[in-house]
């Protein structure tokens, strides 16, 4: 076909962005291109063309009219991780092609097993108490908070400090005694450690 004066090659006007998403959740990688004639859009993951509903109606990935890639649910198994990777969209017309910036799709996870559960502690009243915990492996890296007798601890209280995986109570009182649970949390959800008992005895 003859080159028309008003025709121009594709250019990407909206690039996809990095995303971290939970398994089973929907997400979208955006891509928008301009060009005349209107460019066709294809997506590539780690250099390999991505199949969408245009190729297989049963696919969990849909190519939207805008060119964005919509995931009905993020699929992520113990071994197979078909959605995780580095994506680019490619816009093509007869005058050429344009490639977007890379966008990584990472799948958030939060394992069940704590790397370190807190253990029972016995202290004398007035002494400091330290409970330690390492949350389960996760992505993004889990943060932690603590519960005493199932109620979240307010670390703004001056005797209590939480640093890393350590809960430190200075100048313990009888009222500090109870069952302490470490909670690991990220965008996937929360995991409770095994409870540990703090016993405070009078000298």
């Amino acid at each position: 076909s003859r080159l028309r004066q008003e025709d121009f090659p594709p250019r990407i006007v909206e690039h996809p962005s990095d995303v971290i998403v939970s398994k089973g959740e929907p997400t979208t990688l955006n891509c928008k291109a301009e060009g005349r004639p209107t460019p066709t859009i294809e997506w590539y993951k780690d250099g390999e063309r991505v199949e969408t509903d245009k190729d297989d109606p049963r696919s969990h990935r849909m190519l939207l009219p805008s060119g964005s890639l919509f995931f009905l649910r993020i699929v992520h198994g113990r071994r197979s991780k078909p959605d995780e990777g580095s994506y680019v969209c490619v816009a093509r017309n007869y005058l050429g092609e344009a490639v977007s910036r890379n966008a990584s799709l990472e799948v958030a996870l939060l394992r069940d097993d704590f790397r370190q559960n807190p253990t029972d502690v016995v202290v004398a009243a007035g002494e400091p108490a330290i409970l330690e915990c390492q949350p389960p492996r996760g992505h993004p890296e889990p943060t932690i908070y603590w519960k005493k007798d199932k109620v979240r601890i307010d670390d703004k209280e001056e005797r209590i400090s939480i640093r890393g995986g350590k809960l430190m109570i200075s100048n313990t009182r009888k009222s500090d005694a109870g069952m302490y649970t470490c909670v690991g949390t990220n965008m996937v959800g929360e995991r409770d450690s095994d409870p540990a008992e703090l016993t405070v005895f009078e000298r």
Epitope: K45, V50, D56, V75, S80, K81
Partner: antibody, heavy 118, light 105 residues
Framework: EVQLVQSGAEVKKPGASVKVSCKAS????????MHWVRQAPGQGLEWMGW????????EFPQKFQGRVTMTRDTSITTAYMDLSRLRSDDTAVYYC???????????WGQGTMVTVSS | DIVMTQSPSSLSASVGDRVTITCRAS??????LNWYQQKPGKAPKLLIY???SLQSGVPSRFSGSGSGTDFTLTISSLQPEDFATYYC???????FGGGTKVEIK
């Protein structure tokens, strides 16, 4: 259409090797682990191992270690299973199977009959 | 290694019957349990994954239940095309059960 197409039947002598191929199409080859499963005549299913097409990493049960090799060629989206030092009890149908992101074998090849006979 | 024990190894049933097949793991596998159907001369077909999720395109008369070590596949009303061999598989270490052959009574 998502499918796995395997190479044809083989007849081998004891002590020889066999290489079975599995051509994948209709999906992102590097996104899914490929497994090999065999079935002796009249017997059940036996898992032989997996390959991660993305990096070529493999894992096999103890029984097959040292005798099975799994490789892949990403340029032609094909996985291979090589079994050496064949014995008569290796006579079986050999299947490749894709492991889905739901941890199950959702797509299977049609099977390759390997007969080991002197 | 995790050993999967299926029972019974075979059963006879009639069209319309409710059929139950059990699978026991030698240690806890949470819900990492799949069920397959195989007909003579054919490759296995995935029916149920993650213990109770029905694979796309599989009739709703098939259902799975259980977690930990004990699992069940139920066919609510057996159809002529359901006469086949059924296998459970754990997807932690990937071993299969010995199979259950469902025959016509």
């Amino acid at each position: 259409e998502v499918q796995l197409v395997q190479s044809g039947a083989e007849v081998k002598k004891p002590g020889a090797s066999v290489k079975v191929s599995c051509k994948a199409s209709g999906y992102t080859f590097t996104g899914y682990y490929m497994h090999w499963v065999r079935q002796a005549p009249g017997q059940g299913l036996e898992w032989m191992g997996w390959i991660n097409p993305k990096d070529g990493d493999t894992e096999f049960p103890q029984k097959f270690q040292g005798r099975v090799t799994m490789t892949r060629d990403t340029s032609i989206t094909t996985a291979y299973m090589d079994l050496s030092r064949l014995r008569s009890d290796d006579t079986a149908v050999y299947y490749c199977a894709r492991e889905s992101g739901d941890d199950a074998f959702d797509i299977w090849g049609q099977g390759t009959m390997v007969t080991v006979s002197s | 290694d995790i050993v999967m024990t299926q029972s019974p190894s075979s059963l006879s049933a009639s069209v319309g019957d409710r059929v139950t097949i059990t699978c026991r793991a030698s240690q806890s596998i949470s819900s990492y349990l799949n069920w397959y159907q195989q007909k003579p001369g054919k490759a296995p077909k995935l029916l149920i994954y993650a213990a109770s999720s029905l694979q796309s395109g599989v009739p709703s008369r098939f259902s799975g239940s259980g977690s930990g070590t004990d699992f069940t596949l139920t066919i609510s009303s057996l159809q002529p095309e359901d006469f086949a061999t059924y296998y459970c598989q754990q997807s932690v270490g990937l071993s299969f059960g010995g199979g259950t052959k469902v025959e016509i009574k």
